[in-house]
Interface confidence: low
Amino acid sequence: QLTIESRPFNVAEGKEVLLLAHNVSQNLFGYIWYKGERVDASRRIGSCVIRTQQITPGPAHSGRETIDFNASLLIQNVTQSDTGSYTIQVIKEDLVNEEATGQFRVYPELPKPYITSNNSNPIEDKDAVALTCEPETQDTTYLWWVNNQSLPVSPRLELSSDNRTLTVFNIPRNDTTSYKCETQNPVSVRRSDPVTLNVLYGPDAPTISPLNTPYRAGEYLNLTCHAASNPTAQYFWFVNGTFQQSTQELFIPNITVNNSGSYMCQAHNSATGLNRTTVTAITVYAELPKPYITSNNSNPIEDKDAVTLTCEPETQDTTYLWWVNNQRLSVSSRLELSNDNRTLTVFNIPRNDTTFYECETQNPVSVRRSDPVTLNVLYGPDAPTISPLNTPYRAGENLNLSCHAASNPAAQYFWFVNGTFQQSTQELFIPNITVNNSGSYMCQAHNSATGLNRTTVTAITVYVELPKPYISSNNSNPIEDKDAVTLTCEPVAENTTYLWWVNNQSLSVSPRLQLSNGNRILTLLSVTRNDTGPYECGIQNSESAKRSDPVTLNVTYGPDTPIISPPDLSYRSGANLNLSCHSDSNPSPQYSWLINGTLRQHTQVLFISKITSNNNGAYACFVSNLATGRNNSIVKNISVSSGDSAPGSSGLSASGSGSGLNDIFEAQKIEWHHHHHH
């Protein structure tokens, strides 16, 4: 069966197409090509008679058709109007006709497509954008590429029914998606340039930088405002609500505290018409001055006044700290801070408080510390002390009294003697005092700041110094058991106590010792030899005491009964006789020896050599005391034998008068007396 093949079936405009007849019978007379689906002489393109090799163009021949003897039709430089059916009529030699119809389509060569948008500047997350692939051409297939990938399934992407329009929803900012469209027809494939969407957004809340507040006065302020925005935001600065300038940067040189405030940056998007603002508080701090401490009471009174120390000057946004003795203030019942720490109250301040206080001010740009302050605590006067307290005073000395009272400020001193004001000095000096200067000495201490007075009284006694006493006696040589002795302590003094010592012991009164005349006179009744003393008298008054030199009594006594030694009574003939006589006596007695009634010698010792029986007899020792007028004697009978001595009898003693011995004694006394004076 006769068929027609189109090579190619789809022909690009301007190209050529070859229509080939297949299964063409043998013995052909010729054939004729027609435009269209049927034989129509008016639409004949051309004919070919094989035998004559004659090709004849027909009325539908455009000059671009070429008929070949192999029953093919070549059409060159085709146009879209060439699209359609072409019919071949084959005429066999038996003049029987055979027909076949073929067709091809002519498509334009597609131009490079481009993308148009219904909204060149969509607003983020708000506007949908319709992207249309241009131009619109017949018989064209439209495809879309997103980021060089075929169109993904997404709720944000929607295609029109002809695929020519792509609608994009909810477009985020900074969407860098690349969109391309592709056009296809049977003869060409073309792809557009990529398109990205210019998404309008913002402004976001602007950020102000740097946020290096606080600032120090004298620095510069350079603030930059930035807000994410498309198109780029316009910026407006307001300070404390007042418009300043429309720049992204705000620069203020040499700022002062007055530049502190509320700095607002307003970002404006001219495309979206939106404004966003951010406020930052800029604080400019002045460099703090050196602080100083003021006090509500420069001179507090000890343990009474509270002192309020205030850190000056008061400055805004300043932190106040206190230092006590170079240590950070610690909790104490004596220290109290105000709420703002600017005031420190000190309670119960003791005297001599040397604590020093400093205050420190801090702000974010500076730290300063004051000079130290110490409190001048007023106190006193305490009870004054008067010195020296070496009363009593001796007449003729100098009186130099000093008064001192602990006090701040230093006390003023006033002296009163027996209630009469004397002088206003700390020292009271009286030279060469007398008894009349005795009295009540009062020192008054006065504190001019506290207004307080304190007094101390001391009694000053001035005495005349007692003389050294001495003892007078009515009898320096009293006789024992006979005389009474009167010892008198001299001199007489008023207001004086008299004291006696005997043998360095205080006098013990006995019936034989009597005191009289205010103890000034000591009477010894019937003295004994043991009353020799020594005797001392003392005088004393409240200021002094004096003691006499010792006095001893020369008590005369005796003589006592003498003793002859040795006691032997019998002697051998030819022996030496050596007798010694002793009698206790004051003064020492006069000794006399009588042998058988005859005065032999005035010695205490009797010596006879080579005694014989002739020396037998009564040996008498006589003692005589011229002072007492008393005498005493003892007789001893001595026997001399040619052999052993026989036992002898004890001697006989005699004393006093009324015997022969005594007469001899009296005669002897006269002789002694006579001898004593020659």
Epitope: S262, V279, E312, D340
Partner: antibody
């Protein structure tokens, strides 16, 4: 535009109480120290009380110490003065005033005032 | 407390005059001094602070000077709207105290 509007004034008997309010607008209230200043009829100005921007520091004139309390609510942009134990000598126009920004010193903005009359 | 003493207490002047008001502090307040203007029935208005700093919007005919204890407010050329009562105030710590005021009247 900065605005300070006082309210709460009126007639009160001696010993009574009042609470004054001051509503602020047109500026960042929380950044400004505030004070109350009063003016007795025909007399001069007398500072009454001060509060720092964040409310942590308050001061009072001796004449009102212990009777008046200053406070603020930055979330409501409002300043208050609680006045107790009122006396005849407290009669005055009470102004709220915003200090110059960043300063506890000069009074940059003033309200129109509210009259407090203490009388029996 | 720091006392502020203003002088004079009242002053008569004409438009165009140069006027000076003085304020004395009882102790050193460094430069912590402000000046206010008050018209009848109105709230005070800050003119000058820190002795010499002009508040925003205040005409330049107002100026301040001084330091320590003695301060001066000067109006270089009086305008009709300047007739009011003027107060000085120290802002050197609490209690903030005002001067007793100077009433500026038209002569």
């Amino acid at each position: 535009e900065v605005q300070l509007v006082e309210s709460g004034g009126g007639l009160v008997q001696p010993g009574g109480s009042l609470r004054l309010s001051c509503a602020a607008s047109g500026f960042v209230f929380s950044s400004y120290d505030m004070s109350w200043v009063r003016q007795a009829p025909g007399k001069g100005l007398e500072w009454v009380s001060y509060i720092s921007s964040y409310g942590g520091i308050t001061y009072y004139a001796d004449s009102v110490k212990g009777r008046f309390t200053i406070s603020r609510d930055n979330s409501k942009n409002t300043l208050y003065l609680q006045m107790n134990s009122l006396r005849a000598e407290d009669t005055a126009v009470y102004y709220c005033a915003a200090h110059y920004f960043g300063s506890s010193g000069p009074f940059a903005y003033w309200g129109q005032g509210t009259l407090v009359t203490v009388s029996s | 407390d720091i006392q502020m003493t203003q002088s004079p207490s009242s002053l008569s002047a004409s438009v165009g005059d140069r006027v000076t008001i003085t304020c004395r502090a009882s102790e050193n307040i460094f430069a912590y001094l402000a000046w206010y203007q008050q018209k009848p029935g109105k709230a005070p208005k800050l003119l000058i602070y820190n002795t010499r700093t002009l508040q925003s919007g205040v005409p330049s005919r107002f100026s301040g000077s001084g330091s320590g204890t003695d301060f001066t407010l000067t109006i270089s050329s009086l305008q009709p709207e300047d007739f009011a009562t003027y107060y000085c105030q120290h802002h050197y710590g609490t209690p903030f105290t005002f001067g007793q005021g100077t009433k500026l009247e038209i002569k």
